[in-house]
Each structure stands twice: as structure tokens, then as C-alpha cells.
Interface confidence: low
Amino acid sequence: IPVIEPSGPELVVKPGETVTLRCVGNGSVEWDGPISPHWTLYSDGPSSVLTTNNATFQNTRTYRCTEPGDPLGGSAAIHLYVKDPARPWNVLAKEVVVFEDQDALLPCLLTDPVLEAGVSLVRLRGRPLLRHTNYSFSPWHGFIIHRAKFIQGQDYQCSALMGGRKVMSISIRLKVQKVIPGPPALTLVPAELVRIRGEAAQIVCSASNIDVDFDVFLQHNTTKLAIPQRSDFHDNRYQKVLTLSLGQVDFQHAGNYSCVASNVQGKHSTSMFFQVVESAYLDLSSEQNLIQEVTVGEGLNLKVMVEAYPGLQGFNWTYLGPFSDHQPEPKLANATTKDTYRHTFTLSLPRLKPSEAGRYSFLARNPGGWRALTFELTLRYPPEVSVIWTSINGSGTLLCAASGYPQPNVTWLQCAGHTDRCDEAQVLQVWVDPHPEVLSQEPFQKVTVQSLLTAETLEHNQTYECRAHNSVGSGSWAFIPISAGARTHPPDE
């Protein structure tokens, strides 16, 4: 570590005196910073010497010496005071620039350490500091304004009490710059716009920045628009607003509008699309199939997307039948607005009952007229089966009726013994009816089919079973011939 002679850390001299500062190290040494012309600098072996024959108040400052070859990078310093009764201050810089919330050093150095007790900081021409100005003083460095604020960017003077009167330094201008975190904040409203040809429209592009130095413009497709700019300042931010007002829109006004703002940190842009239409429109669509099938007892949401301009004047869900005159519970209908011109309407149908199958229509109206979208809801049912013994054209016949949706298919089984249901081990014969007769097939209702098994004689210790199944489930009915006629068994519940 280098050593300075005299040993310091402070040296007080009078104006006109000769001052010699010698720095000695193990290797070569050098003095930091720019050395004013009043000093003579020469090397003497491993030492470097600063000398002046005529010290002035302007030589007041800290002198630091370093040894470049020292791996520890040590340095030594001495602070020189040139005690001038007429010049209590040596101002090193007339302008200081800092960012907001940084400490601002106003480098007015006291030329006489004895004066430290009577120093103060004032604004130009002795005006007091702004309230909440938090500062401290160091005789070696000057005044420090802590966490400087933008509003504290002012002209300051350092004041010292000499012989009962205040002596001011020359002024120091402090510039406090706002910290610009990024490009200006932008808003472009509306985010999307639709107008009918001939209507009025307004697009507002606004940008805000913490500093006044920024630009904003509105662009239509690739054309930069010449629009008067309104400026404002609120919430500690500078605002610039461009308002495009169109009294009567036409198709050439349609297209992409971009709001672009820039500052020293860069550029920020946001866009919106303006659509001009010939007349009012109202479009209904669904991502779902309009023909829906759901198993009885389950739930379903019917969803309709609406695009409309002008806005909707009314909308509702209606049940069109055929089973009852009930109408959808309003609590089951839900509306969400995706954006200004797009909406989603949902009808929730929980635990569907047989009487709730049928047509559901969503109707909406705007000045363009009415539109409707109709869903057809069919319920799926597992088959229900019954078997009766009858005589057809003198022949004994087993008649199986199966009812369900989708249409059930029918299989007959003959098995040994008397049983409520044939299991695989007992099965003697299987007949599949490829084309059972359809007895009824009404929209939104179960399909009822009938299958006949003609038998001249039914063997008494055997069971005949009719089985029906569809995509939802299956059902069966067992028939056991007995001497007194016949008896049947429905399946176990």
C-alpha cells in the first residue's frame, strides 16, 4: 500500500504557500484523477511528487495515490485545505446530474475545516430548501442530498458562516432525471371497433411517461395520421392523447390502427382493428352439433356464440316442445361477454328428464333483426323388455316388445331348466332377429320394436329369454312354459 508524505489525513495551508505531496510505494505509483495546471508533477525513483509554489483555494480537494502493480489495489489519500478567508468554498462542478432516488453530491468543498459548524445548503439567492429535503455535509466532499426527487432539481448554493455573516458559493445546478423503466405506457381504445357506414366513430390513442420527452402517433394501416395532440400531467406522469374522431365512417376508414409511442428506452405499440359494415348484423353459431343425444338423467350445456353490431336488445332461450309447455329456468341460462361484439350464451340442462327432450331455441335481437338457433335434443334410454305368449294364426307365438333409444336389437335364447335369466352354460339355442318390426318411432321418443318367436310346442322344462340391447344398456325378459299355460319373469331389478 502506498504512503503519502506529509502523513495527513488532512493538510491545512494558507494561500500562496508551497505545498509538496510525495507518494511512495514498493513499485511505481501514480496520482489519481486530473491534476490541475497549478501543480508540478515529477517522479523520483519509486515515488511521485506533486508540488505547487502558490497554493490557492482551488487546490482544496482530496488527493489520492495508487500503486497499479499492487495486487491488493491499495491506495492512500490526503485532503488539502487552502484556507482562504475570502473564499470559503471550492466548487468542483457547476452541474450535477443524477437519477431519481439516487444520492446527489453537490461538490462544494470547504476551504477551512474550522467553518464546518456553520455550513448550510440553500437554494439560489438564499431561498430555503424544499420541504422533505434530506441532506448531509462532508467537509471533504460537499453536501449530499439523499434519495433526490425530481422536484429537487434546482439551483443550489453552499453557505458558510464567516465572521457572523453568510458567505455563499457559486451556484450548482442539480438535475434529477426520472428513472425511465421502459417505453411509454400505452392505451388504445376501443380494443376493437365496428361501425355501420355513415355512423360516427372515435379512436383514442394515449401514452404516458414519467418524463416529458417522448413521442406518440396513431397509424392507420401504414399511414401515420396527422392528429392534434392533447398533453396533460397527472398521477406524476406526462400524458399525450390523440383522438381520431370520424363524423361519418366509410369503408376506407376500416383497417388496422396502431398507437405507437417511444422514448429513450425504446418503442411500444398496440393495435386494434376497425371494421366498417354496410348494415347491422347479428350472427348466431355453435361449436356443438345442433342435433344432440344425451342419456336420460345426464346433463348437457347448450352453447351459442353471438356476434352482433349494434348491441343486443334482447335474447332468450325457448323450449319449443313437443312434450310440455315448460320453459327453461332463467337461472339455468348464463351469458358471458367475450368482448364488445361477441357474446356466449349457455343453457345448462342438468339431470335431463324424459319430458325435457325436444327442441331448444336461442333467440336474439338487435336493430338488424331477429335471429334464432335451434338445438334438437334426443334422450337415450336403455331398453325395456316384455314378453307375452299369444296365438297368431293358430300358432303359439312368443311376442317380445323392446323399447329404448337408440333402437334396440333383439336376441332370443333357449336354455335348459327353469331360470330367471339364461347364463352361458345353460344356453341351448340363440336366435338373432335381424329385422325386428318397428312399432313406433316418434321424434325425441323411445323406439319400440317387436320380435316374434313362433313355436309349435314349447318344452316345459326350458326357459325362453328375449334380450334387447343398445348403446346405453340392455334389458331382458324370461318366459317359462308351464302345463297350465305359461309364466313370464321380468329381469331382476
Epitope: 355501420i196 360516427a200 366513430a201 363524423g247 336493430p367 338488424g368 333483426g369
Partner: antibody
Framework: QVQLQQSGPELVKPGASVKLSCKAS????????INWVKQRPGQGLEWIGW????????KYNEKFKGKATLTVDTSSRTVYMEFHSLTSEDSAVYFC????????????WGQGTLVTVSA | KIVLTQSPASLAVSLRQRATISCRAS??????????MHWFQQKSGQPPKLLIY???NLESGVPARFSGSGSRTDFTLTIDPVEADDAATYYC?????????FGSGTKLELK
């Protein structure tokens, strides 16, 4: 071009009703409201109401509710205004006028129908 | 109900001079930057004719000597210069709120 052709003058007795017509041509009939406006001799203009031909919906000035009934026949592109229980106060010229969406001005007018209520 | 008060009730203007007609609304109205105030001209025995729509827009085919201005509650129709054909009654009308209402009219005569 857009035209609104109104029916001819009417001379009616107090207490009777009168049905005026306004036939539209030259534009998509169902897209625009048809308004009716009353003007008494030497007086100003008074809005009666509008009918929306697409679905027959109406909007009336409260003052004329029950007095006027607005209907539309889209097949003949004709709008009707029936005025009931006529008194001498109903003697006036009645105009039909086309407007577009809410806020649009009455850009096209019929020539007017003079109704005279007299015993 | 918005009441529109026109002034003056009548005025006489020399040819090639300026005519100014005022229309004051009983309450301020403005909708999305649109001012639904319109001006009509009516000559004896004829239906009204649209001159200005939305306060300041000139209807197609109307001479440029007609102009409209104003916002909120105070609106003005200006004819400059007046021509012989402009002798008529002028009405303001608001389409902002039901019931739609007209001003009482201003009769323009030529000196």
C-alpha cells in the same frame, strides 16, 4: 331511389278512426324504421312513434299511446298508422319518415297526408 | 323529455348576409362522442328536408353555405351567405332520447 308514398287526404267525423298508409320503395324495406310525425296547421313537428318492419316491433311517444297504432305489411312494403277516436285536435298533416339505427336522422320523408276532422 | 328551445322565433336577413339560428336543449346529451342533433328545413306545403345531421355533418346534396356546430346543450345552424331560396322554417331535432323531439321552429324571411 328511396321513396315514401303516402295515401291521399282524409275527411273524417269526430269519434271515427282513420288508417293512413306509407308505401316504401328503392331500399331494403326491413332494415329501416318508419317514423310518423304530426304537424298541425301553422304549427311545429311532433314525433308519434316508429315501427320496425323486420319484426313489426314499435316504439311510441307516450302522448300517442292508445291514440295511434302502427302496423306493417312486408309483402306490400307498406306501413300503416291507424288513428282512433278522432277529435278536431287530430286535424293535421301526418308524415312518414325513414330512419336507420337509433340516433339516425329522418333522411327521407313522405309527402304527407292531410287529415281533417269535421262534423 | 328533452325540450328544444329555438331562437329567434323568426328573423329577417338580407341577401348574401349571414343567418344564425340557435337551439338549446333542456339537458346535455352526448352518446359515444356522437351528438344526435339534426337540422331540417321546411317550406310551405312540403315535408321537412334534412340539412345537417349529428350536429355538424352536411347532408349529401345540401349547399355548403349551411353549417352546424355545437355540443352538449347549445347548437347553432348557420347560413352564410343567405340566398333567396333559403326562406323557410328551420327545425332542430334530437334523436338521443325518447320521445324524439323537435324545436319550435325558426322562420327565416328575406329583407
Amino acid at each position: 331511389q328511396v321513396q315514401l308514398q303516402q295515401s291521399g287526404p282524409e275527411l273524417v267525423k269526430p269519434g271515427a278512426s282513420v288508417k293512413l298508409s306509407c308505401k316504401a320503395s328503392g331500399y331494403t324495406f326491413t332494415t329501416y324504421d318508419i317514423n310518423w310525425v304530426k304537424q298541425r296547421p301553422g304549427q311545429g313537428l311532433e314525433w308519434i312513434g316508429w315501427v320496425y318492419p323486420r319484426d313489426g316491433s314499435t316504439k311510441y311517444n307516450e302522448k300517442f299511446k292508445g291514440k295511434a297504432t302502427l302496423t306493417v305489411d312486408t309483402s306490400s312494403r307498406t306501413v300503416y298508422m291507424e288513428f282512433h277516436s278522432l277529435t278536431s285536435e287530430d286535424s293535421a298533416v301526418y308524415f312518414c319518415a325513414r330512419s336507420g339505427l337509433t340516433g339516425s336522422p329522418f333522411a327521407y320523408w313522405g309527402q304527407g297526408t292531410l287529415v281533417t276532422v269535421s262534423a | 323529455k328533452i325540450v328544444l328551445t329555438q331562437s329567434p322565433a323568426s328573423l329577417a336577413v338580407s341577401l348574401r348576409q349571414r343567418a344564425t339560428i340557435s337551439c338549446r336543449a333542456s339537458e346535455s346529451f352526448d352518446s359515444y362522442g356522437n351528438t344526435f342533433m339534426h337540422w331540417f328545413q321546411q317550406k310551405s306545403g312540403q315535408p321537412p328536408k334534412l340539412l345537417i345531421y349529428r350536429a355538424s355533418n352536411l347532408e349529401s346534396g345540401v349547399p355548403a353555405r349551411f353549417s352546424g356546430s355545437g355540443s352538449r346543450t347549445d347548437f347553432t345552424l348557420t347560413i352564410d351567405p343567405v340566398e333567396a331560396d333559403d326562406a323557410a322554417t328551420y327545425y332542430c331535432q334530437q334523436n338521443n332520447e325518447y320521445p324524439l323531439t323537435f324545436g319550435s321552429g325558426t322562420k327565416l324571411e328575406l329583407k
